[in-house]
């Protein structure tokens, strides 16, 4: 089943997705869509990057990390209950059937009523301990035979829980990563 991430109404939700470019600036097109990943591309695209830049985005959806280094994690600003559902991150690696797709489930909870104001947390409160993706077997090393200069060396697991927004930067070392090159 999809990996589940949580946020409260009014927060910014964070959906992690990473790859490692073969070389600086050697980017791979990525799309984010609302709904499970279809056979090609992303359905209901909310954001897209190409080999150079973010070339399409919609209101409230943005990349907070450094996408030029492969951090294509999606931030959804000021979420509402309607933002609940499955999101697709697709890393469109060139070649024969090389693209990778990840389905992430976002669960939005009503905002907690607290007696005193508290610091708003920007990112989802808890992450599952293991990242699994529909359509993929166990994490393993794969070689992209059609592109001799590109290797898909690792799809790693998300092993940490995000307990506070200050840990967001650590996700690059613990998130779902596709390493190319």
């Amino acid at each position: 089943s999809e990996v589940e991430y949580r946020a409260e109404v009014g927060q910014n939700a964070y959906l992690p997705c990473f790859y490692t470019p073969a070389a600086p600036g050697n980017l791979v097109p990525v799309c984010w869509g609302k709904g499970a990943c279809p056979v090609f591309e992303c359905g209901n695209v909310v954001l897209r990057t190409d080999e150079r830049d973010v070339n399409y985005w919609t209101s409230r959806y943005w990349l907070n990390g450094d996408f030029r280094k492969g951090d294509v994690s999606l931030t959804i600003e000021n979420v509402t209950l309607a933002d609940s559902g499955i999101y697709c991150c697709r890393i469109q690696i060139p070649g024969i059937m090389n693209d990778e797709k990840f389905n992430l489930k976002l669960v939005i909870k009503p905002a907690k009523v607290t007696p005193a104001p508290t610091r708003q947390r920007d990112f989802t409160a808890a992450f599952p301990r293991m990242l699994t993706t529909r359509g993929h077997g166990p994490a393993e090393t794969q070689t992209l035979g059609s592109l001799p200069d590109i290797n898909l060396t690792q799809i790693s697991t998300l092993a940490n829980e995000l307990r506070d927004s200050r840990l967001a930067n650590d996700l690059r070392d613990s998130g779902a990563t596709i390493r190319i090159g």
Epitope: C42, G43, G95
Partner: antibody
Framework: QVQLVESGGGLVKPGGSLRLSCAAS????????MSWIRQAPGKGLEWVSS????????YYADSVKGRFTISRDNAKNSLYLQLNSLRDDDTAVYYC?????????????WGQGTTVTVSS | DIVMTQSPSSLSASVGDRVTITCRAS??????LNWYQQKPGRAPKLLIY???SLQSGVPSRFSGSGSGTDFTLTISSLQPEDFATYYC?????????FGGGTKVEIK
């Protein structure tokens, strides 16, 4: 008028080769994924191969992988399928089709088909 | 591979009848299910996309429903031009797969 027209079919001996073409008109060809679908005589539809709008990403059915090659020339609004090492069970009508929205919403434009007959 | 199982494989009906064709996927395909109509010697024609959305130009007597693994194509009042073979197709993952087809014949 949105249109796809296939050509290149014919009679070929087992082990032989053919190159199918699909000429597109009436739409911005480079915006769409494209696919080849085939239908053996009296049988159902079978997906063969697909290619992304830029041509950088390619997909094949296991039954044709290593024998067939899909390609496209966006400057010429053309889709191609190179058929090598043909077998009797490759005999079929071959259709090219446009994948609307990357196929998550189906193949909305089809050509009339070109017939490939593999026989000794 | 995702196996698409269509039923019935054929049916006989009269003009004006309500016809229902079912399609079952071997795994969850969300709403990535399309329906096509094919007449002898012709290319398939897209009728329904994304399980329930009517393709432009298709008569409203055609409708689709379902999500996950079970899907239905309904023709509310069969017309003479509707006698054809109908195929479902999943576009959730490669290989793209079609159902075996349902031939709708005149009773």
């Amino acid at each position: 008028q949105v249109q796809l027209v296939e050509s290149g079919g014919g009679l070929v001996k087992p082990g032989g080769s053919l190159r199918l073409s699909c000429a597109a008109s009436g739409f911005t060809f480079s915006d769409y994924y494209m696919s080849w679908i085939r239908q053996a005589p009296g049988k159902g539809l079978e997906w063969v191969s697909s290619i992304s709008n830029s041509g950088s990403t390619i997909y094949y059915a296991d039954s044709v992988k290593g024998r067939f090659t899909i390609s496209r020339d966006n400057a010429k609004n053309s889709l191609y399928l190179q058929l090598n090492s043909l077998r009797d069970d490759d005999t079929a009508v071959y259709y090219c089709a446009r994948n609307w929205q990357g196929a998550d919403y189906g193949m909305d434009v089809w050509g009339q088909g070109t017939t490939v007959t593999v026989s000794s | 591979d995702i196996v698409m199982t269509q039923s019935p494989s054929s049916l006989s009906a009269s003009v004006g009848d309500r016809v229902t064709i079912t399609c079952r996927a071997s795994q969850n395909i969300s709403s990535y299910l399309n329906w096509y109509q094919q007449k002898p010697g012709r290319a398939p024609k897209l009728l329904i996309y994304a399980a329930s959305s009517l393709q432009s130009g298709v008569p409203s007597r055609f409708s689709g429903s379902g999500s996950g693994t079970d899907f239905t194509l309904t023709i509310s009042s069969l017309q003479p031009e509707d006698f054809a073979t109908y195929y479902c197709q999943q576009s959730y993952s490669t290989p793209l797969t079609f159902g075996g087809g349902t031939k709708v014949e005149i009773k």
